[in-house]
Interface confidence: low
């Protein structure tokens, strides 16, 4: 979790002088409770937005938006603490809106936004907005939380972000797998425009079962520049196991930007259709 870099963080708006500060996620009002505290945020909305850094990189960001309730408690509102919790790691990042002037009611409902929390593909977050000062220990809560899931790199808008492109999201290998005679598979895929090696991982399964009956790994050396975007054809020999007929082919690239952690692509070959007439049951059990 981090903030979008090199960006002037602004929270001022007409009628309000405001500054954005880093926060330890432990506001002073927890330690020194106040008697009068504001009510909670209203209509908290979290959306997936995309923002460029000054270097031109594109990142997914959490766009946080909320409004104030139209009650007298805004007279005691001194700011807000925005917290983003990454659920699988429990990592938390906070910022604080510090109001440098008193809020007054005006003809429109007060609305606040913040779009500088950088989020990761395929991660889940809990976003909380706390109005400050926080309530006394037994006081009514004055925060709102919402859960937010960032889609993975297969999502069209995500695909072109820097973190997704770094993991090879733009590479479409267009894998084809063909069953040949003599227990062989021909795997064909499109190479990317980088001189890096690939690995083909073959896993075979019995019909309708999920435990593998054959596994094989095939290394493909780095292509030369003239081979970029060309098709690579590989013939894999299968073990002659009766019923070991469903094959999953996975291609793992080793691009320089993601090394061992690049997006993998896969294709599956189903078992051939069973004949309508049942095969005679052998009078012995094959040992495999």
């Amino acid at each position: 979790l981090r903030l979008l870099d090199h960006r002037a963080l602004v929270c001022s708006q007409p009628g309000l002088n405001c500054t954005v500060k880093n926060s330890t996620c432990l506001d002073d009002s927890w330690i020194h409770p106040r008697n009068l505290t504001p009510s909670s945020p209203k209509d908290l909305q979290i959306q997936l937005h995309f923002a460029h850094t000054q270097q031109g990189d594109l990142f997914p960001v959490a766009h946080i938006e909320w409004t104030l309730q139209t009650d007298a408690s805004i007279l005691y509102l001194e700011g807000a603490e925005l917290s983003v919790l990454q659920l699988n790691t429990n990592e938390r990042l906070c910022v604080r809106f510090e109001f440098l002037s008193k809020l007054r009611h005006h003809h429109r409902r007060w609305r606040f936004t913040f779009s500088h929390f950088v989020v990761d593909p395929d991660q889940e977050y809990e976003v909380t907005v706390h109005h400050l000062p926080k309530p006394i220990p037994d006081g009514d809560p004055n925060h709102q939380s919402k859960n937010f899931l960032v889609p993975d790199c297969e999502h069209a808008r995500m695909k072109v972000t820097t973190p997704c492109m770094s993991s090879g999201s733009l590479w479409d290998p267009n894998i084809t797998v063909e069953t040949l005679e003599a227990h062989q598979l021909r795997v064909s895929f499109t190479l990317w425009n980088e001189s890096t090696h690939y690995q083909i991982l073959l896993t075979s399964f019995p019909h309708m079962e999920n435990h593998s009956c054959f596994e094989h790994m095939h290394h493909i050396p780095a292509p030369r520049p003239e081979e970029f975007h060309q098709r690579s054809n590989v013939t894999l020999t299968l073990r002659n196991l009766k019923g070991c007929c469903r094959h999953q082919v996975q291609i793992q690239p080793f691009f320089s930007s993601c090394l061992n952690d690049c997006l993998r692509h896969s294709a599956t070959v189903s078992c051939p259709e069973m004949p309508d007439t049942p095969e005679p049951i052998p009078d012995y059990m094959p040992l495999w």
Epitope: I46, F148, P151
Partner: antibody
Framework: QVQLQESGPGLVKPSETLPLTCTVS????????WSWIRQPAGKGLEWIGR???????IYNPSLKSRVTMSIDTSKNQFSLTLSSVTAADTAVYYC???????????????????WGQGTTVTVSS | DIQMTQSPSSLSASVGDRVTITCRAS??????LGWYQQKPGKAPKRLIY???SFQSGVPSRFSGSGSGTGFTLTISSLQPEDFATYYC?????????FGQGTKVEIK
Amino acid sequence: QVQLQESGPGLVKPSETLPLTCTVSGGSIRSYYWSWIRQPAGKGLEWIGRIYRSGNTIYNPSLKSRVTMSIDTSKNQFSLTLSSVTAADTAVYYCARENYSESSGLYYYYGMDVWGQGTTVTVSS
Amino acid sequence: DIQMTQSPSSLSASVGDRVTITCRASQGIRNDLGWYQQKPGKAPKRLIYAASSFQSGVPSRFSGSGSGTGFTLTISSLQPEDFATYYCLQHNSYPPTFGQGTKVEIK
């Protein structure tokens, strides 16, 4: 092994409010989303809405004006109230565990994998 | 809302038959689809999630396939305990919606 158990009145009068509670045992309510689904006799299934541990809710637009959900993590329970009931609300009501999240109108979730056995609710005077 | 259209609405089959149930979405839903089995008086039970992934403990004769708008649940060899109603559920868009169900009856 997570188990869900619905409880509530079997009979409710028209225009009254239906309260239902689902108790989660064998696991923590803090780890998933929790939903309600209903099924009128001989008919299909309708998703009512879901609640998360933080109290965030999403309701089916067709029922939104009448539905309220709440959660009590200390009791490992979540609840449904359906107001202004009519005979059309007569159904078996199920609670279920659901694992999903939202993002900018894109909803990524993985369906309901654990269900309660259901409780029959009849709306009649 | 996304409409899920299941076909057929009912079918009669014999033990040992291969049964195929289809579900069509009114718009693309990637592979965000599950298949559920419901017996009279019981809660639905999930068989397949993510269009083709097996729910643990479900017999391997059940399989799912499809992506986008067309999906299929196949029972390779119908067993006596498989006579039930089957529903598809899309969980790609809010709100989640079920198909109207396919009742599998004994011929």
